[in-house]
């Protein structure tokens, strides 16, 4: 059993997992970037059995899944910034 | 394999309002990364996205039009529906789901439902 | 919006030799995360639009191996290696990379 915790360094995750998990079993991703004590990336998985699995970043098919969710994260067109000239 | 296919009324008056049905298969929208999107294609023209939902229920809309725009799903059903309120000529067209898999932005098709407007 | 211009309009071919379609996107169609959703799709006479290449190069599944995609930035092209019957019809670049979604205009490959 994989476990998440709060531990003393602040990361979630006790273990990480590589083992692929079906995306129909799969309710949402929590991705938490490196930082707030913790020294590395972590990815949450919430299955729909509402089991919760620290997969490893590196996994190949985790990356698929977010990608998913970083293509709709940056689907906004980034408005360009124009500087006034001060005359 | 997977299948879409549209249904809609046909004919409409102006200003009365758009529902369509895209009704599919051999995928479920429960399924993490899918989500199934609305494109128009007038006769003899070009297709223009309308709208899109995802499998959590998040939706985009075309700017253009969202305020005439509502998109929904019944998961359970494997359906997924759009409203266009207020229509005018200008939306007689072909009406056409397709469905996005990841990154795969409308990988699979549905055969298209004619609308038209007229008084 | 991301306005997304084809050229030509309309491509005479022969039966057998190579077509080029050109798409340019009006800003770069390339997202923070790196990647860029450009695909291709062909519509062929009185059928639905088909997939055929997906972020840029990727051949979708089934599709020959004599269609490829290239291009990056807001430049992308769709080759087809040697023209065969089957693949007369209207071709259509798509961005899925920022909201609204937009196609290209067309290019209707034909018959010389």
């Known amino acids: 059993v994989l476990e998440v915790y709060y531990t003393s360094l602040r990361c979630r995750c006790v273990q990480e997992s590589s083992v692929f998990i079906p995306r129909r079993f799969i309710d949402r991703i929590q991705i938490l970037p490196r930082g707030n004590g913790c020294p590395r990336k972590e990815i949450i998985v919430w299955k729909k059995n509402k089991s919760i699995v620290c997969v490893d970043p590196q996994a190949e098919w985790i990356q698929r899944m977010m990608e998913v969710l970083r293509k709709r994260s940056s689907s906004t067109l980034p408005v360009p910034v124009f500087k006034r000239k001060i005359p | 394999q997977v299948t879409l296919k549209e249904s809609g009324p046909g004919i409409l008056q102006p200003s009365q309002t758009l529902s369509l049905t895209c009704s599919f298969s051999?995928?479920?929208?429960?399924?993490?990364?899918?989500?199934v999107g609305w494109i128009r294609q007038p006769s003899g023209k070009g297709l223009e996205w309308l709208a899109h939902i995802w499998w959590d229920d998040e939706k985009y809309y075309n700017p253009a039009l969202k305020s005439r725009l509502t998109i929904s799903k019944d998961t359970s059903k494997n359906q997924v529906f759009l409203k266009i309120a207020n229509v005018d000529t200008a939306d007689t067209a072909t009406y056409y789901c397709a469905r996005i898999d990841g990154y795969y932005d409308f990988d699979y098709w549905g055969q298209g439902t004619t609308l038209t407007v007229s008084s | 919006d991301v306005l997304m211009t084809q050229t030509p309009l309309s491509l005479p071919v022969s039966l057998g030799t190579q077509a080029s379609i050109s798409c340019r996107s009006s800003?770069?169609?390339?997202?923070?995360?790196?990647?860029?959703?450009l695909q291709w799709y062909l519509q062929k006479p009185g059928q639905s639009p088909q997939l055929l290449i997906y972020?840029?190069?990727n051949r979708f599944s089934g599709v020959p191996d004599r269609f490829s995609g290239s291009g990056s930035g807001t430049d992308f092209t769709l080759k087809i290696s040697r023209v065969e019957a089957e693949d007369l019809g209207v071709y259509y670049c798509?961005?899925?990379?920022?909201?609204?979604?937009?196609f290209g205009g067309g290019t209707k490959l034909e018959i010389k």
């Open positions: 798509f961005q899925g990379s920022y909201v609204p979604y937009t």
């Open positions: 800003h770069s169609i390339v997202q923070d995360n790196g990647n860029t959703y």
């Open positions: 972020k840029v190069s």
């Open positions: 051999e995928f479920s929208l429960s399924v993490f990364g899918m989500g």
